[in-house]
Amino acid sequence: DGCNDIFMKNEMLSASQPFAFNCTFPPITSGEVSVTWYKNSSKIPVSKIIQSRIHQDETWILFLPMEWGDSGVYQCVIKGRDSCHRIHVNLTVFEKQWCDTSVKGLPNLSDEYKQILHLGKDDSLTCHLHFPKSCILGPIKWYKDCNEITGERFTVLETRLLVSNVSAEDRGNYACQVILTHSGKQYEVLNGITVSITERAGYGGSVPKIIYPKNNSIEVQLGTTLIVDCNITDTKDNTNLRCWRVNNTLVDDYYNESKRIREGVETHASFREYNLYTVNITFLEVKMEDYGLPFMCHAGVSAAYIMLQLPAPDFRAY
């Protein structure tokens, strides 16, 4: 059928809660393409009806919620004018009681559900929440060994739990909980995270971590003004340059004449062992030429992009 097959690594998922997977494969999905989801090589596409428990939402496949029988191989087919790619995703659903203390870690969990804190340092855990724009996420609550986390050493910052002066007692089973609302219905997302500790210096203390963006797309109307923050954590003594680039050129240089897209002034918040930096990019007026173009946030050797995309047509307006 002329499609190139791409195999993603297996995803281990928790039953009875929402799950979404975005069919993005830059640069394939950056141009004008159509994306269609299928299950187990079925010829019938996944439904696009939003009332369906499993449905396609733009480039995403959305499970509201995930159930036992949903395990299997899902394919998303990306068709461009001159190309076709079929991405295979193996989803395995398991039942996990996050408060079952008899289980010491889950070796088969996806990497984002296994995180490491550095002893004696200020560090953070991330609640990975990957859902389409149609899903509205409430505030995140954090738990350790089934008890809600409190205390001045812990700070919730967006999707992260900041932990100051990490100790050996901070290892163990964590969970982040959020209420997801979709089409007026509410669902609970509870992500378990097994947290181990180390005294090692991690990245050698010099590689910055880009918290946002995450190589993601943003829906934005033509002609609107848009401001996007790039959030970076880095060591206090770092000398890394932080900037936005497009086509491998600083945005301020690329749009030197029109000044339509500009990089903002960098700000930072200081924590005990690291700094959290924010540098934004402002689109005074989004133009057609901006869509599908990766706008890269750079921090030292780290980089991540956002891509603007037109919102799906709202047929309810007709």
Partner: antibody, heavy 120, light 106 residues
């Protein structure tokens, strides 16, 4: 159950490069820290270095100019290369990983070790 | 580099004896790790985070210490305890081992 297995030639000529493979089963090398340690005959343990979940590598400064640790996540294997070997590099080489009781530095899982002799 | 010095380097003792092995670091370390190794075998994690016994390690073993001085103690030596014991630190790279203490039957 996490298992590690070293493989590679048991005999290497002086000035050549020692190459070993550690094949991991029961865990993904994209989580945790994956270490190389050696034990000289009749002597103690020496820490060589590690490759982390992110691909970051750390080398013991005493070996840094000669050592390279790399990985192939698709095969779930990681590798040790030690260049310009001499008789002093004759040792039993172990691959090992931690994570026991959520402590990455507690090296609980070890390979059985492979003896590498440097001799012409 | 942090130097780890174990004492004694070797020790002859009898079954039933109380044995203490000391590991001294040249600078402060946060935690100590201990490994047991028998001839021709890979080392085994014995004690982690200074005082926690690894799975399968008998309760006659204990670990203690802080700063620069750490000890591994066997309250009543058994035949299967004769082996070489190594301490290790991760506080400062390079992650050094002690030179080992060989525990032999008297």
């Amino acid at each position: 159950q996490v298992q590690l297995q070293e493989s590679g030639p048991g005999l290497v000529k002086p000035s050549q490069t020692l190459s070993l493979t550690c094949t991991v089963s029961g865990a993904s090398i994209t989580s945790g820290y994956w270490n190389w340690i050696r034990n000289h005959p009749g002597k103690g343990l020496e820490y060589i270095g590690y490759i982390s979940y992110s691909g970051y590598t750390y080398y013991n400064p005493s070996l840094k100019s000669r050592v390279t640790i790399s990985r192939d996540t698709s095969k779930n294997q990681y590798y040790l290369k030690l260049s310009s070997v001499t008789a002093a590099d004759t040792a039993v080489y172990y691959c090992a990983t931690g994570g026991y009781d959520y402590v990455e530095d507690a090296l609980y899982y070890w390979g059985q070790g492979t003896l590498v002799t440097v001799s012409s | 580099d942090i130097q780890m010095t174990q004492s004694p380097s070797s020790l002859s003792a009898s079954v039933g004896d109380r044995v203490t092995i000391t590991c001294r670091a040249s600078s402060n370390v946060r935690y100590m790790y201990w490994y047991q190794q028998k001839p021709g075998k890979a080392p085994k994690l014995w004690i982690y985070l200074t005082s926690n016994l690894a799975s399968g390690v008998p309760s006659r073993f204990s670990g203690s210490g802080s700063g620069t001085s750490y000890t591994l103690t066997i309250s009543s030596l058994q035949p299967e305890d004769f082996a070489t014991y190594y301490c290790q630190q991760y506080t400062t790279s390079p992650y050094t081992f002690g030179q080992g203490t060989k525990l032999e039957i008297k």
